[in-house]
């Protein structure tokens, strides 16, 4: 099967790597602009330079390309707790994450929120907090995860998944109580 | 057919309170995360707050926080949006939605689901 070629793509595919075709002209192939760069002007005639200026302060291009226009530079999501790991430069877009301690929950593809990585308190760390997953924890006898959090057996209730994790917990006090008696 | 359909909305006084409900069907509700979204008279749409799929991550508008609480019952398959210490300017229709889709950067939301809304008017 054939892949489904845009317009551009087709256009695009006629001339080397490197080179776009003309828009007016389909017998002039133009050299395309380096990142960092739009095109200005496209080149008038085989050849001939293609007229690139420099993105402006807010925009950037990161790979070669014959776009009119920079592309606007992103802005890190403080409401998501995103912070600045680099700023926007004429070639390379924003870089926003997380900080140290924090890993990243995606509500879509591209848009994500910082959260804290948990300390697995009342267990022991199985797996270290990456940058797009939380701490998985291991809980000490007594107690069961919810939420990723260790709570104590005390707190389970009988419809709770937890009656498994804790169920030896229960037994031994019921067999306490039970040898107590005789 | 995905179908979610809101109730609780209704008038309340400044300073009260509501619980808002959504009940989904048409989808493995347990599998999805689920948003709020809000439009009040006159504006744009605002995305009010978000749950995962399995309730342990929570995200709240500025303009909501530490007053509304998102939740659901994945037994139920229902989600819930729990309004205290109501303004004025809470007054909007509220929207449960699914399927939520971000531009490159996520400036722009869009959903692909929506429930029918209900309206919640906070008024003396």
């Known amino acids: 099967l054939v892949p489904h070629l845009g317009d551009r793509e087709k256009r695009d595919s006629v001339c080397p790597q490197g080179k776009y075709i003309h828009p007016q002209n389909n017998s002039i192939c133009c050299t395309k602009c380096h990142k960092g760069t739009y095109l200005y002007n496209d080149c008038p005639g085989p050849g001939q330079d293609t007229d690139c200026r420099e993105c402006e302060s807010g925009s950037f291009t990161a790979s070669e390309n014959h776009l009119r226009h920079c592309l606007s530079c992103s802005k890190c999501r403080k409401e998501m707790g995103q912070v600045e790991i680099s700023s926007c430069t004429v070639d390379r877009d924003t870089v926003c994450g997380c900080r140290k301690n924090q890993y990243r929950h995606y509500w879509s593809e591209n848009l994500f929120q910082c959260f804290n990585c948990s300390l697995c308190l009342n267990g022991t760390v199985h797996l270290s907090c990456q940058e797009k997953q939380n701490t998985v924890c291991t809980c000490h006898a007594g107690f069961f995860l919810r939420e990723n959090e260790c709570v104590s057996c005390s707190n389970c209730k009988k419809s709770l998944e937890c009656t498994k994790l804790c169920l030896p917990q229960i037994e031994n006090v019921k067999g306490t109580e039970d040898s107590g008696t005789t | 057919e995905v179908q979610l359909l809101e109730s609780g909305g209704g008038l309340v006084q400044p300073g009260g309170s509501l619980r808002l409900s959504c009940a989904a069907s048409g989808f493995t509700f347990s599998g999805y995360n689920m948003y709020w979204v809000r439009q009040a008279p006159g504006k744009g749409l605002e995305w009010v707050s978000a749950?995962?799929?399995?309730?342990?991550?929570?995200y709240y508008a500025d303009s909501v926080k530490g007053r509304f609480t998102i939740s659901r019952d994945n037994s139920k398959n229902t989600l819930y949006l729990q309004m205290n210490s109501l303004r004025a300017e809470d007054t909007a229709v509220y929207y449960c939605?699914?399927?939520?889709?971000?531009?490159?950067?996520?400036?722009?939301?869009?959903?692909?689901?929506w429930g029918q809304g209900t309206l919640v008017t906070v008024s003396s």
């Open positions: 939605a699914e399927g939520l889709q971000t531009s490159d950067h996520g400036e722009r939301i869009s959903f692909d689901y």
């Open positions: 749950i995962d799929a399995y309730g342990t991550h929570t």
